[in-house]
């Protein structure tokens, strides 16, 4: 699986999850998030050669098409597969609020 | 929605579904598919600026991150959202078989 266990331990050029730390204030301008200061959102990148973690029949077909027609602009793209939530602390006035934001952390990727 | 109705009628540079005809024999080397000869598989392409048909909170965050950090390599990618099946005819020896291949035709795209 193209997950953090594999991708963070290997120098993988093809589609894989990559570490990306995002600081809420500096990188997003989100001053309203008090905790955490930032988090590992991660991201997916790398080429999608034929059959590499193909998401659907279409991505398999497109991967083969791209292999046999290298000049073609159509090819699958490396995108998030499994995502995890992130719990944040923020304030509404003087009242603290804790919220779980869904799909914030990429744990694995796929070719779609 | 970034679907065929919209994308095929507009000159859209950003993420959209694009027409792509695939000939089974010529483009994939699939001699075993007898009907249809080919089909419009279509594909997704184009930049994913902040908030454009964002698939998840992560893609929204990544889109914003990319806007504020233009030099960053991390950005959402334009990939299939809705896919439709395709019915094909092939032969197993001298016996005709009809099969519905799922997720073969891209009808709309999203930024993921």
């Amino acid at each position: 699986a193209l997950d953090t266990n594999y991708c963070f331990r290997n120098l993988e050029e093809n589609c894989c999850v990559r570490p990306l730390y995002i600081d809420f204030r500096q990188d997003l301008g989100w001053k309203w998030v008090h905790e955490p200061k930032g988090y590992y959102a991660n991201f997916c990148s790398g080429p999608c050669p034929y059959l590499r973690s193909a998401d659907t029949t279409h991505s398999t077909v497109l991967g083969l098409y791209n292999t046999l027609n290298p000049e073609a602009s159509a090819s699958p793209c490396c995108v998030p597969q499994d995502l995890e939530p992130l719990t944040i602390l923020y304030y509404v006035g003087r009242t603290p609020k804790v919220e779980q934001l869904s799909n914030m952390v990429v744990k694995s990727c796929k070719c779609s | 929605a970034l679907d065929t109705n919209y994308c095929f009628r507009n000159l859209e540079e950003n993420c959209c579904v694009r027409p792509l005809y695939i000939d089974f024999r010529q483009d994939l080397g699939w001699k075993w598919v007898h009907e249809p000869k080919g089909y419009y598989a279509n594909f997704c392409s184009g930049p994913c600026p902040y908030l454009r048909s964002a698939d998840t909170t992560h893609s929204t965050v990544l889109g914003l991150y990319n806007t504020l950090n233009p030099e960053a390599s991390a950005s959402p990618c334009c990939v299939p959202q809705d896919l439709e099946p395709l019915t094909i005819l092939y032969y197993v020896g001298r016996t005709p078989k009809v099969e519905q291949l799922s997720n073969m035709v891209v009808k709309s795209c999203k930024c993921s």
Epitope: - | H34, E35, T87, L89, R94, P96
Partner: antibody, heavy 119, light 111 residues
């Protein structure tokens, strides 16, 4: 260009054997089923024998009129299909065509070879 | 086995005529939207030639005056304007199941 060339036909008395050959070129022979179709004088086309590719275990078919007398075989290394005809009868007199069916239709045909069974 | 019955067994026509040949199967030769019926032209001393495959698809190099239609058990071959070189015997053939069989043929003669 697809070419199918039959050979081996001729005049033979009832009873003995004859082997027809069909040499194929211009297509991926190994991938496709091959057939022998005949036309007897004044009659229509009849599929007499058929053999599919190795992928489908070289499965064969014979029409009732030739079953247990005729044998179809193929040599993929030489791109040749054979029709071994034993215990020939006068009603086997016909033009025998070699043909290839990539799908459900017989797309290409040889020029035919005449087999005459007569005493 | 599926039997194919062609009609008429023979017909006389003139150059320029519209000719229609029918082929009826003893059971359906269609599967889903695919119609597994094919048509051939056979001239004396020549090998048969594929005209139409899967009921309505024109084979490579065949003039557009030839057309096919039908589904299920009833199929038609039409020659829109008969030409001198079209005088021949025409056969239908199915591939719905093994064994594939041919119709008895329709001989098109000069009137």
């Amino acid at each position: 260009e697809v070419q199918l060339v039959e050979s081996g036909g001729g005049l033979v008395q009832p009873g003995p054997s004859l082997r027809l050959s069909c040499t194929a070129s211009g297509f991926d022979f190994n991938s496709y089923g091959m057939s022998w179709v005949r036309q007897a004088p004044g009659k229509g086309l009849e599929l007499v024998a058929d053999i599919v590719s190795k992928t489908y275990n070289y499965t064969t078919y014979y029409s009732d009129s030739v079953k247990d007398r005729f044998t179809i075989s193929r040599d993929d290394s030489k791109s040749i299909v054979y029709l071994q005809m034993n215990s020939l009868k006068t009603e086997d007199t016909a033009v025998y065509y070699c043909t290839v069916a990539p799908g459900g239709s017989f797309d290409y045909w040889g020029q035919g070879t005449l087999v005459t069974v007569s005493s | 086995d599926i039997q194919l019955t062609q009609s008429p067994s023979s017909l006389s026509a003139s150059v320029g005529d519209r000719v229609t040949i029918t082929c009826r199967a003893s059971q359906s030769v269609s599967i889903s939207r695919f119609n597994l019926m094919h048509w051939y032209q056979h001239k004396p001393g020549k090998q048969p030639k594929l005209l139409i495959y899967r009921a309505s698809n024109l084979a490579s190099g065949i003039p557009s005056r030839f057309s096919g239609s039908g589904s299920g058990t009833d199929f038609t071959l039409t020659i829109s304007s008969l030409q001198p070189e079209d005088f021949a015997t025409y056969y239908c053939q199915h591939s719905r199941e093994s064994p594939w069989t041919f119709g008895g043929g329709t001989k098109v003669e000069i009137k």
